[in-house]
Amino acid sequence: ESALITQQDLAPQQRAAPQQKRSSPSEGLCPPGHHISEDGRDCISCKYGQDYSTHWNDLLFCLRCTRCDSGEVELSPCTTTRNTVCQCEEGTFREEDSPEMCRKCRTGCPRGMVKVGDCTPWSDIECVHKESGTKHSGEVPAVEETVTSSPGTPASPCSLSG
């Protein structure tokens, strides 16, 4: 690694930031909207629109603001005490088990089912069977994989010495 020093290399309180206000920690903690200095003596304000902290803390730097992805709309901007709030665009939703991306909502229900719930930013349309009323997740059942064993193990290209 190069020994050249850039602004980024330096600790948060060493970088030029004349606009950042300082105050003293209370019982070793700094209030929301601030982080603590490396020596624990000062509270340094977060930078509006860049970073934030939501609780009393002894973090050495504030938390980076989330940037809304394409396919998301910004409901509220990042402040020094609250992260950005992003929401999936109309017609898309974010599932709990795949929170990293917005997925397109289905346009309709499969045959024999009726729609009982609309597409929202946090859920797909909800379908139930006409007769039974049981929910349908929209997942296509996976085709069972056939596992075939290979005859013998091929020689390893990596020697024992690595």
Partner: antibody, heavy 115, light 110 residues
């Protein structure tokens, strides 16, 4: 970054290890000490900030003291036991904007504590 | 004290394959996680900082993900040279939190 001072010591004999740096200033970087017992994993001991404030792992408080000059960082093992036998590394902590990380390491110095 | 739990302790895969290593923190460390590679007789080498950012000179076959308490290192297109022990570490981010390491994962390349 280079460590020195590792040797064979008897239990209870204080020992000071030195980390000598060149090409950068200790007034701009925090430095960590990490150790590794033979055949074991890495164990963080503590850190000295760019301003000279020290922080220690919970288990290391009272057992180690970190200090620095303009070009060296010292680790004093106050009262070594056989469990302190390890290779001791010092590492430079680089600030990456929203995270620190130990990006530059010395080769390590071996301390053996035995009676 | 912060505890970092790394799994598995050892994993074996063929050249060209993919290996996934998990790291769990006992408390929220946000994105302050680093991954290191260590070979016998050498100091650790920084691979990834801030959960997913590649250190200088590290090939893009290495990738990191996660946040809060759950983190993952993935090595794809395995090469013989990737045989090493890998460690996660909670990087320095708070004056009261230890910069604890995980127990390590030995990667064997066949």
């Amino acid at each position: 970054v280079e460590e020195s001072g590792g040797r064979l010591v008897t239990p209870g004999t204080p020992l000071t290890l030195t980390c000598t740096v060149s090409g950068f200033s200790l007034s701009n970087y925090a430095m960590s000490w990490v150790r590794q017992a033979p055949g074991k994993g890495l164990e963080w001991i503590g850190i000295i900030s760019s301003s000279g404030t020290t922080y220690y792992a919970s288990w290391a408080k009272g057992r180690f003291t970190i200090s620095k000059t303009s070009t060296t960082v010292d680790l004093k093992v106050t009262s070594p036991t056989t469990e302190d036998t390890a290779t001791y590394f010092c590492a430079r902590e680089t600030y990456y904007g929203y995270s620190y990380a130990a990006g530059l390491w010395g080769p390590g110095t071996l301390v053996t504590v035995s009676s | 004290a912060l505890v970092m739990t790394q799994t598995p302790s050892s994993v074996s895969a063929a050249v060209g394959g993919t290996v996934t290593i998990n790291c769990q923190a006992s408390q929220n460390i946000y994105s302050n996680l680093a991954w290191f590679q260590q070979k016998p007789g050498q100091p650790p080498k920084l691979l990834i900082y801030e959960t997913s950012k590649l250190a200088s000179g590290v090939p893009s076959r290495f990738s990191g993900s996660g946040s809060g308490t759950e983190f993952t290192l993935t090595i794809s297109d395995l090469e013989c040279d990737d045989a090493a022990t890998y460690y996660c570490q909670s990087s320095w981010h708070s004056i009261s939190t230890d910069c604890a390491f995980g127990g390590g994962t030995e990667v064997v390349v066949k």
